[in-house]
Interface confidence: low
């Protein structure tokens, strides 16, 4: 194989969670390099990951400028010893990607919970995204607003029958049986989406009514 032989990229795939967005493709290059270009339309291409031997490219900075736009990327293949010419190198277009619709929802984290009498209060951590405005990273809620719901799955620790509650805030306040321990997990949901509607479920947390002490996990307080 000559050094000027290049292979056109294939299997272009968007990997995106909470707007952190990476384009992946194949194959690993031998004696050639890739350049990724991205555009909110077919034209006005912006170079990213210039002359790289990687098979992935972080395009978060580009897509976060307007998360409701639809973007297309392309991966160009160049010989490793290339000099800039007017001739367009071979390339492959990605599928279209609309961050607001297509980014996966990350696994939520239960920030705190408290069971007092017949009420269970559960608060979901306000997840940060890599979407930045005026130097501040926005929360998932800032971007999605009321499009973003959370579902709470909860059950008596002594049984397996799950119940479900939904909120379009980051907080649940539900009725429970006094003196019973409950286990629960949360899931982020965007009902208006056709695909990528749901996040993975959070880790399961459980109350322990017989203990009146507070437990601290990491930097979050969990009250029982």
């Amino acid at each position: 194989t000559g050094t000027t032989d290049v292979i056109v990229a294939y299997n272009l795939t968007w990997k995106s969670t909470n707007f952190k967005t990476i384009l992946e493709w194949e194959p690993k290059p031998i004696n050639y390099v890739y350049t990724v270009q991205i555009s909110p339309r077919l034209g006005d291409w912006k170079n990213k990951c210039f002359h790289t031997t990687d098979t992935e490219c972080d395009v978060t900075d580009e897509i976060m400028r307007n998360v409701k736009e639809t973007y297309v990327a392309r991966v160009l293949s160049y010989p490793a010893d290339t000099v800039l010419t007017a001739q367009e190198p071979p390339f492959t277009n990605s599928p279209p990607f609309t961050p607001y619709l297509d980014t996966n929802l990350g696994q939520p984290v239960i920030q705190s919970f408290e069971q007092v009498g017949t009420k269970l209060n559960v608060t979901v951590e306000a997840a940060r995204t890599l979407v930045r405005v005026n130097g501040t990273f926005l929360r998932l809620r800032d971007v999605f607003g009321k499009d973003l719901n959370y579902t709470l799955y909860y059950w008596r620790a002594s049984s397996t029958g799950k119940k479900k509650a939904t909120t379009n805030t980051n907080e649940f306040l539900i009725d429970v049986d006094k003196g019973e321990n409950y286990c629960f997990s949360v899931q982020a949901v965007i009902p208006s989406r056709r695909v990528n509607q749901k996040s993975p479920e959070s880790r399961i947390e459980c109350t322990s009514q017989e203990k009146a002490v507070s437990r601290e996990t990491g930097h979050h307080h969990h009250h029982h």
Epitope: P40, K46, R65, N66, V133, D142
Partner: antibody
Framework: QVQLQQWGAGLLKPSETLSLTCAVY????????WSWIRQPPGKGLEWIGE???????RYNPSLKSRVTISVDTSKNQFSLKLSSVTAADTAVYYC??????????????????WGKGTTVTVSS | EIVLTQSPGTLSLSPGERATLSCRAS???????LAWYQQKPGQAPRLLIY???SRANGIPDRFSGSGSGTDFTLTISRLEPEDFAVYYC?????????FGGGTKVEIK
Amino acid sequence: QVQLQQWGAGLLKPSETLSLTCAVYGGSLSGYYWSWIRQPPGKGLEWIGEIGASGSTRYNPSLKSRVTISVDTSKNQFSLKLSSVTAADTAVYYCARDTPYYYEGGYYYYMDVWGKGTTVTVSS
Amino acid sequence: EIVLTQSPGTLSLSPGERATLSCRASDSVDSSYLAWYQQKPGQAPRLLIYGAFSRANGIPDRFSGSGSGTDFTLTISRLEPEDFAVYYCQQAGVVPYTFGGGTKVEIK
């Protein structure tokens, strides 16, 4: 510093099509929406419509049947066409940049860069 | 369509005085949708305030915005000679985006 430079025919006869173009200098079309606004003599401002860099449009329903806004990313410019004009379309026409603004509960825009305006007169 | 009504139509004040301009919406507007613009004769409008109370780049702190729901206010704490102009409120949340009829701030 982003600047908008606009041009187009200033004198039209009734039933003709108004055509204006706005070029973006010092910045990209990408990541923003681009609006047209008009102001009849001695009156207030009326939003005509907007276009995203990807070509998605929103129009004022009162003008929708006559308006076309398009974008040419290769030239970094966007255009307005308004068909079947009458004397009521006489106005100063402005192009403007709608900057994305995120907030808790949604994603909207405000117009932070404006063209100088083009006076369009419709007269027989 | 959301109709924005500005009052007064004309405000006659002297330099150094305080100006209070009102913008009333026909339907509730989230404060984040509301902007204020200044326009001088023969010039394009200039963004002053967005999100009802955030000053745009380069706008002096004598300009401030407030309000919520259907009632919004632009206040100029101490009028400078260059502040005499027409002021428009605008909502950018519901299509069609609409502007108020304007308030002219003139020298008394």
